[in-house]
Interface confidence: medium
Amino acid sequence: GITIPRNPGCPNSEDKNFPRTVMVNLNIHNRNTNTNPKRSSDYYNRSTSPWNLHRNEDPERYPSVIWEAKCRHLGCINADGNVDYHMNSVPIQQEILVLRREPPHCPNSFRLEKILVSVGCTCVTPIVHHVA
Amino acid sequence: GITIPRNPGCPNSEDKNFPRTVMVNLNIHNRNTNTNPKRSSDYYNRSTSPWNLHRNEDPERYPSVIWEAKCRHLGCINADGNVDYHMNSVPIQQEILVLRREPPHCPNSFRLEKILVSVGCTCVTPIVHHVA
């Protein structure tokens, strides 16, 4: 496993008052079967609303690396390969669960955290506001 | 707190051999700050690769309810509102962490699990295989 410099203020895992705490087994069970190994592979490049993937790294978080999608264009790619600004590339977001070391640098003490991530982009028809 | 009919086989949280176990504080911190507030969208309907959302519920898992995207069409919606089969609607998938009660019905013992979810759909140019 990984050796983490231990914070002397780390909570005692036997402490009955350690707030709202449960035991979590980190032997991660992967429910993702091999039925679809390809997944979203090169969709980021082939999409009409392509995106770049940015590495978001935080050693105090598990998972420590999360890839964030940023749409490449405001518009969408048309059949000629040009950007069509009559359509919009927008990020698809999802809230996910992560574990954050708390207090920092404690090897076996975490807090649940919800974060919002952009997973990819999709091309949408814009909402047009008509001025009276 | 909650009263749960306790499984007699629940692990002892003080057991030093309880495999790769950490303490997790369940006070969920919400990192969705004002810089990135959750803005509700109807992208699932306005997308050129629209999708439906299906409810996946598992009471032994947290989050218990996960909404799965299923693309409505094989092709994408063109400017005329028709399905264009020269393009493909594909799901954007993401691996997420969930907590599973393990053994089942134990109030304070969980296992991390990775699952693959479809968050939305995007429109991609198909890969054309030319036969020699």
Epitope: R20, V22, I92, Q93, Q94, E95, I96, L97, K114, L116 | G1, I2, I4, L26, N27, N30, N32, N34, P37, K38, R39, S40, S41, D42, Y43, Y44, L53, E57, P59, E60, Y62, P63, S64, V65, I66, W67, P107, V119, G120
Partner: antibody, heavy 126, light 107 residues
Framework: EVQLVQSGAEVKKPGESLKISCKAS????????ISWVRQAPGQGLEWMGG????????DYAQKFQGRVTITADESTTTAYMELSGLTSDDTAVYYC???????????????????WGQGTTVTVSS | EIVLTQSPDFQSVTPKEKVTITCRAS??????LHWYQQKPDQSPKLLIK???HSISGVPSRFSGSGSGTDFTLTINGLEAEDAGTYYC?????????FGQGTKVDIK
Amino acid sequence: EVQLVQSGAEVKKPGESLKISCKASGGSFRSYGISWVRQAPGQGLEWMGGITTFFGITDYAQKFQGRVTITADESTTTAYMELSGLTSDDTAVYYCARDPNEFWNGYYATHDFDYWGQGTTVTVSS
Amino acid sequence: EIVLTQSPDFQSVTPKEKVTITCRASQIIGSELHWYQQKPDQSPKLLIKYASHSISGVPSRFSGSGSGTDFTLTINGLEAEDAGTYYCHQSYDLPHTFGQGTKVDIK
């Protein structure tokens, strides 16, 4: 269809405690949260606190901290709200409400109150 | 805590008229704002969730809009059965808070 059925009206004296139940049926009790909201006569809605049933963790409004305890019993799919040190200001209708407690996915709500109990009228008077 | 301020406090409306109720949050709350209707001696009922999303079984004359700090509930073509008090509710941050309510009655 989710239904929340609350216990009956109560008359209490100042200084006493109150415990109201909220029996849930339909849907998986563990999949959602239960919040308690009260409404004093002629007044608006006031959130007191809630419980995430999956973990049994609670959150309380600062105003009620130390005086309110929210619990839940999975075996009977019932949530409880206990309020101690009652005064005449606690005279109100108390509602339990379901919080879908779902993670955000761009559309479906996470913390609206989509189902409500019928309300429990509590009168505190000497 | 996040304060929600509704306006107006009271509105007397003729049937078939359009009703607009606004709710302003003391800080940005994204779209995490919901609208409820409460009729006398009844429990509140969810009308609109996440600022603009309709609820199954709620008449289409009810609609919501806005994001950030300013939100609007619109009733297009008020009907007699719509009399009651309307509340906005934010779930962006704890504690959950409600607006003070807007009472709508029929002329």
